[in-house]
């Protein structure tokens, strides 16, 4: 039921926007896809959610949303923003989610992001960002999720990530990154998910993933790796690993010995000629093993200690016989 307060709230709804109470005596305001070229001026101070996505907003003035101290989510995706000035988000003390994807930003709006201490989720994907300044995330101590995919990055912004010790998920996919240096993510000890797919990565520092002590998902699919990514050896909690569609020719012996928690590995569409017989040993959690197109494999892998496979796909291989123990090793 509506209370007198919710009536007051709804009277503060901007023209043509859709508004509804959020259940906490605050207001959810949806002004998306209305052809707006500037921000609405008569927003209720009690707004907790503001969706301005899919409009024609090309610039933000300093302090364009005064007094929205209760605003928790601001969506500005799909506009024509090329630059966000210092002070654009001043006073948004409660802001937890900021969506800036699908704009035309060329740089991370460093000054605008300062002091967003409550921010937990930041979307900067699908822009034209080619440079991430070293200190651009330095005040975002609560940040949990960061999207930087589909931009123009050519290298990992190593210094910028040093302050994001609370980060849990990050995507750098669909950029032009060619190398991951040692300790690239050295301070991201809480990171659980890392997407690096669809880049141009051809080389990995041997300690490039050191420090990622919580990582469970690593996606290196669709890159230019020509060697097995041995740097994964530090990822003791890794559960899901993808490096399909690269140029890897061999899976070494004991390839995953440092990753005993692996559940799924995807590495099809690599020109694999050699697979060490011990490569897939001692992976008790592994459920799926797919070796599509590994045309040079002639020996069935030794699956000692890998006893819980539910799906084993070996297409295009040249295995002429199965070991007698294979049925003992599989459930």
């Amino acid at each position: 039921g509506s209370s007198p307060r919710s009536g007051v709230l709804l009277r503060g709804c901007p023209t043509h926007c859709h508004c509804e109470p959020d259940g906490r005596m605050l207001l959810r305001v949806d002004c998306s896809d209305l052809g707006l070229s500037e921000l609405p001026s008569n927003l209720s101070v009690f707004t907790s959610y503001l969706d301005l996505s899919m409009n024609n907003i090309s610039q933000l003035l300093p302090n364009p949303l005064p007094s929205l101290r209760f605003l928790e989510e601001l969506r500005l995706a799909g506009n024509a923003l090329t630059y966000i000035p210092k002070g654009a988000f001043t006073g948004l003390y409660s802001l937890k989610v900021l969506m800036l994807q699908n704009n035309q930003l060329r740089h991370v709006p460093t000054e605008a992001l300062q002091n967003l201490r409550s921010l937990q989720s930041l979307r900067l994907d699908a822009n034209h960002i080619s440079y991430v300044p070293p200190s651009c995330f330095s005040g975002l101590h609560s940040l949990r999720h960061l999207w930087l995919d589909d931009n123009a990055l050519t290298e990992i912004p190593v210094q910028a990530f040093r302050s994001l010790s609370a980060l849990q998920a990050m995507t750098l996919a669909l950029n032009k990154i060619h190398h991951i240096p040692d300790y690239a993510f050295g301070n991201l000890s809480s990171l659980v998910v890392l997407h690096l797919h669809n880049n141009r990565i051809h080389s990995l520092g041997k300690k490039c993933f050191d420090g990622l002590h919580s990582l469970e998902t690593l996606d290196l699919n669709y890159n230019n790796l020509d060697e097995f990514p041995t740097a994964i050896r530090t990822l003791s909690n890794l559960k899901e690993l993808g490096f399909h569609s690269n140029n890897i020719r061999s899976i070494p012996e004991k390839a995953f010995v440092g990753n005993p928690s692996l559940i799924t590995i995807h590495f099809y569409d690599n020109p694999i000629q050699f697979v060490g017989r011990s490569a897939f040993q001692h992976l008790p959690e592994l459920r799926t093993l797919t070796l599509n197109g590994a045309s040079q494999i002639t020996e069935f892998p030794d699956l000692t200690g890998t006893a819980n496979l539910e799906s084993l796909t070996l297409t295009g291989a040249q295995i002429s016989s199965l070991p007698q123990t294979v049925c003992n090793q599989l459930p």
Epitope: Q159, N187, H213
Partner: antibody, heavy 118, light 111 residues
């Protein structure tokens, strides 16, 4: 609490071998490099090599490569340094340390004095 | 190998005064904006203790009178106000490339 506890002092003859142990506790042993460093009496620090216990990967200082073997036993969270063909100039305190933030050595064992004397 | 050279070899400073130790690497130890240079303190009969990592980051639990600065080849450890318990030998170390190397050490004493 992170701790690295090393084995006791050793006295060896020239040409012999020594094996020093380093037992880790208080953290995930498999996920951090263990580094070995030595310090001759009154001298500075010298890096010997490292091992990543989870994968058995090792790297050695070329100076020691032919005489040093670093191993680990994950079941007991213990790393080992073995140095062969000992000579008097190998007399030193041998330390194990954990490779922490960005490879800095954030926790150290108490040290093991190895004396090589005829 | 990268050679680390510390200066001075020893330093006598009055209590409460500033102590400054320099470390020069024979080649740059910077990579993608990170300086792979760390500082340690060693007291007699004890193992070294990490003070500063990546040139300027204070290790947890280390008093903030210790600070580090520098990049590429030239680095400095500063003790802003020397205390009696700071008497020790201080070492810089690089892990930019194998073999990881240490400076020869700087002995800090009270004047």
């Amino acid at each position: 609490e992170v701790q690295l506890v090393q084995s006791g002092a050793e006295v060896k003859k020239p040409g012999a071998s020594v094996k020093v142990s380093c037992k880790a506790s208080g953290y995930t042993f498999s996920a951090y490099w263990i580094e070995w460093v030595r310090q001759a009496p009154g001298q500075g620090l010298e890096w010997i090599g490292e091992i990543l216990p989870g994968s058995d990967s090792t790297d050695y200082n070329e100076k020691f490569k032919v005489r040093v073997t670093i191993t680990r036993d994950t079941s007991t969270s213990t790393a080992y340094l073995e140095l062969s063909s000992l000579r008097s100039e190998d007399t030193a305190v041998y330390y194990c340390a954990r490779g922490g933030h960005y490879g800095s050595l954030d926790y150290w064992g108490q040290g093991t004095l190895v004396t090589v004397s005829s | 190998d990268i050679v680390m050279t510390q200066s001075p070899d020893s330093l006598a400073v009055s209590l409460g005064e500033r102590a400054t130790i320099n470390c020069r690497a024979s080649e740059s130890v910077d990579n993608y904006g990170n300086s792979f240079m760390h500082w340690y303190q060693q007291k007699p009969g004890q193992p070294p203790k990490l003070l500063i990592y990546l040139a300027s980051n204070l290790e947890s639990g280390v008093p903030d009178r210790f600070s580090g600065s520098g990049s590429r080849t030239d680095f400095t450890l500063t003790i802003s106000s020397l205390q009696a318990e700071d008497v020790a030998v201080y070492y810089c170390q690089q892990n930019y490339e194998d073999p990881f190397t240490f400076g020869q050490g700087t002995k800090v004493e009270i004047k």
